[in-house]
């Protein structure tokens, strides 16, 4: 079975962890394919490690474990994605998790940012 | 770096048979699945048979199941196609195909001509 | 089997010009999607994988777009070195199937 929040919540700008975790007494995960709505973002496959796709490679970075890390996040990245995990003999499980990115506090709340100068 | 070469490829009579042998370097064999793949004279790529590297799962295209075998040996890191009750349709030069994560196919040998005639 | 339709079948073009093939599957293929390169008496050469993302090597101006079952190969400003024939084909289930293939030519 496949474990995963369903839905988390990310600032624009920031970064999130895409996390789906595969529990079985009988089947070992061969490759792990995680997707933003049907584009790729990432592979993993234990014969060949990490690849990730050329389109989200300054953006993703494989891991923690077989999760992945977005970072640089739009508004345009909420929505879902789907981890599938491969295994043998068990056949194909799949996850899916919403992302929700959100205006960081700094824009909501409106406030400028200043840089104060420590005294010396 | 990566390289394929095929081999075994010829003029072949009608219900004869025919080995190729793909002989693949610069990488490690035994982590792809391979693939064969070939092209008619003058006409487009039609997929043959694939082995996958981790399970060593096959499968066939239903033109060639029951007469072509696919094989591998990790050990010498060469990809088999056992071609048996050959037909003319077949001609074809035949490629061997390195496939990473069963999804594209990166790499592909210079192919080798088979000719099924009488 | 998913069929893959590929058009136009063949094209003519000049050098600089913008040029669109299109590939559309039989049923949904999510993003299980390649192009391919290939010139006479040559293997073919992998130019999009995963319907969007460029190999490495490939010139930035070949781009793939496209998802479920229309998609589109585009090459920007087409070069002397781009006139060729140019596949399509899906990895989402075997049998793996390719589409007839687009010939660029020179106009």
């Known amino acids: 079975t496949i474990d995963t929040k369903r839905n988390i919540s990310a600032e624009e700008g920031g970064s999130v962890i895409l996390q789906c975790h595969f529990s079985s007494d009988t089947a070992e995960v061969t490759q792990v394919d995680w997707k933003q709505q049907d584009q790729l973002l990432a592979i993993y496959s234990v014969d060949l490690g990490w690849h990730v796709a050329s389109v989200f490679s300054d953006r993703v970075v494989p891991g923690p474990s077989l999760g992945l890390t977005f970072q640089s996040l739009t508004m345009n990245d909420t929505g879902e994605y789907f981890c599938t995990y491969h295994t043998y003999p068990g056949g194909i499980y799949k996850g899916r998790i919403f992302l929700k990115v959100q205006e960081s506090s700094d824009d909501r709340n409106g406030l400028a940012q200043f840089q104060t100068a420590p005294l010396g | 770096e990566v390289q394929l070469l095929e081999s075994g490829g010829g003029l072949v009579q009608p219900g004869g048979s025919l080995r190729l042998s793909c002989a693949a370097s610069?990488?490690?064999?035994?982590?792809?699945?391979m693939h064969w793949v070939r092209q008619a004279p003058g006409k487009g790529l039609e997929w043959v048979a694939s082995?996958?590297?981790?399970?060593?799962?096959?499968s066939y295209a239903d033109s060639v199941k029951g007469r072509f075998t696919i094989s591998r040996d990790n050990s010498k890191n060469t990809l088999y196609l056992q071609m048996n009750s050959l037909r003319a349709e077949d001609t074809a030069v035949y490629y061997c195909?390195?496939?990473?994560?069963?999804?594209?196919?990166?790499?592909w040998g210079q192919g080798t001509l088979v000719t099924v005639s009488s | 089997d998913i069929q893959m339709t590929q058009s136009p079948s063949s094209l003519s073009a000049s050098v600089g010009d913008r040029v669109t093939i299109t590939c559309r599957a039989s049923?949904?293929?999510?993003?299980?999607l390649n192009w391919y390169q290939q010139k006479p008496g040559k293997a073919p050469k992998l130019l999009i994988y995963?319907?969007?993302s460029l190999q490495s090597g490939v010139p930035s101006r070949f781009s793939g777009s496209g998802s479920g079952t229309d998609f589109t190969l585009t090459i920007s400003s087409l070069q002397p070195e781009d006139f060729a024939t140019y596949y399509c084909?899906?990895?989402?289930?075997?049998?793996?199937?390719f589409g007839g293939g687009t010939k660029v030519e020179i106009k």
């Open positions: 195909a390195r496939v990473p994560y069963d999804y594209w196919i990166d790499y």
């Open positions: 610069g990488f490690t064999f035994s982590s792809y699945s």
């Open positions: 082995i996958k590297g981790n399970t060593g799962s096959i």
């Open positions: 049923q949904s293929i999510s993003s299980y």
């Open positions: 995963a319907a969007s």
């Open positions: 084909q899906q990895s989402y289930s075997t049998p793996l199937t």
